[in-house]
């Protein structure tokens, strides 16, 4: 499994380095998760031809993956720090059920999948500390999540492979947009 941010050899070798600021720590955490996603995508793409498939729409109908839109206040035009932060945290909370689904989907990268899931939980905690308006953040309903998980796991093999690919791709895109937005804060 990859080494969590702040524990890589560079940090150990340079104890005189200034401690990371809150935004640098969040940035590093997202980068770490993105590296993990990259490794998981490699396994998915090597194992099946999902990454080149044109039938994504079929599987996408079953999913309601969080997406960033203009109204969320995360883009440069119409940027709104508080609205955007709420969107990022809410989106990450919504992704958690999909990250849970990924846990049994990898053979050689099982630890990596767990690391992505755990690091996302840590990222949510970092961001919640940053948010002023925690009341505006809606937490997904556990019962709804449980039934969604059951439904996803009951899909045929092809749809499960496609779902895995779509979750990884969407999560990567959501994190990259979040990274960009958080740097404006």
């Amino acid at each position: 499994a990859p080494v969590p941010p702040g524990e890589d050899s560079k940090d150990v070798a340079a104890p005189h380095r200034q401690p990371l600021t809150s935004s640098e720590r969040i940035d590093k955490q997202i980068r770490y998760i993105l590296d993990g996603i990259s490794a998981l995508r490699k396994e998915t793409c090597n194992k099946s031809n999902m990454c080149e498939s044109s039938k994504e729409a079929l599987a996408e109908n079953n999913l309601n993956l969080p997406k960033m839109a203009e109204k969320d206040g995360c883009f440069q035009s119409g940027f709104n720090e508080e609205t955007c932060l709420v969107k990022i945290i809410t989106g990450l909370l919504e992704f958690e059920v999909y990250l849970e689904y990924l846990q049994n989907r990898f053979e050689s990268s099982e630890e990596q999948a767990r690391a992505v899931q755990m690091s996302t939980k840590v990222l949510i905690q970092f961001l919640q500390k940053k948010a002023k308006n925690l009341d505006a953040i809606t937490t997904p309903d556990p019962t709804t999540n449980a039934s969604l998980l059951t439904k996803l796991q009951a899909q045929n093999q092809w749809l499960q492979d496609m779902t895995t690919h779509l979750i990884l791709r969407s999560f990567k895109e959501f994190l990259q947009s979040s990274l960009r937005a958080l740097r404006q804060m």
Partner: antibody, heavy 120, light 106 residues
Amino acid sequence: EVQLVESGGGLVQPGGSLRLSCAASGFTISSNYMIWVRQAPGKGLEWVSDLYYYAGDTYYADSVKGRFTMSRDISKNTVYLQMNSLRAEDTAVYYCARWEEEGRGYIDVWGRGTLVTVSS
Amino acid sequence: DIQMTQSPSTLSASVGDRVTITCRASQGISSWLAWYQQKPGKAPKVLIYKASTLESGVPSRFSGSGSGTEFTLTISSLQPDDFATYYCQQSWLGGSFGQGTKLEIK
């Protein structure tokens, strides 16, 4: 072969408009960050704008904000730079480029550039 | 915009010299900085990314260091091919460049 070809440059009067095109080949713009950089004659490089492939989110330099618009046409694998209210200081060679996508943070593919001259 | 201030603007040196170019960001950019070399009439070519990582195929005489707001590019022993203009660029937010450093023969 990965390539970017700009077109649409030329002579325009102050206050006028111009639309630059950048045709990409060898990769898809729908899954890459794209960027416009300009260089005035004998001067340094200036970042103008970039377009993040996800949701088409754009980001602009203060010097062009409100006047320039970056967009794309995925079906044509082409990005555009619509330049309005042009000023003499916008005279430059405009390069279309691609941000290296996997998080290393640099430009890995450049076009050859197209010259825009703003003069009366 | 994040402002990038590069110095010196011109540097005169001889083959074999060790030279250092500095770049300062107006706000913290972590390690999101790249160095480019540009020759007349050509598009820039990346030398260093993430402040200190050497791009593949770039000679090891080039090195980069720094983090936060202060960065340096060092050429340990100048070669004839190194006389060119060098730019730093941040990729923390947007992609602003430094003004450039023209490295010329003394």
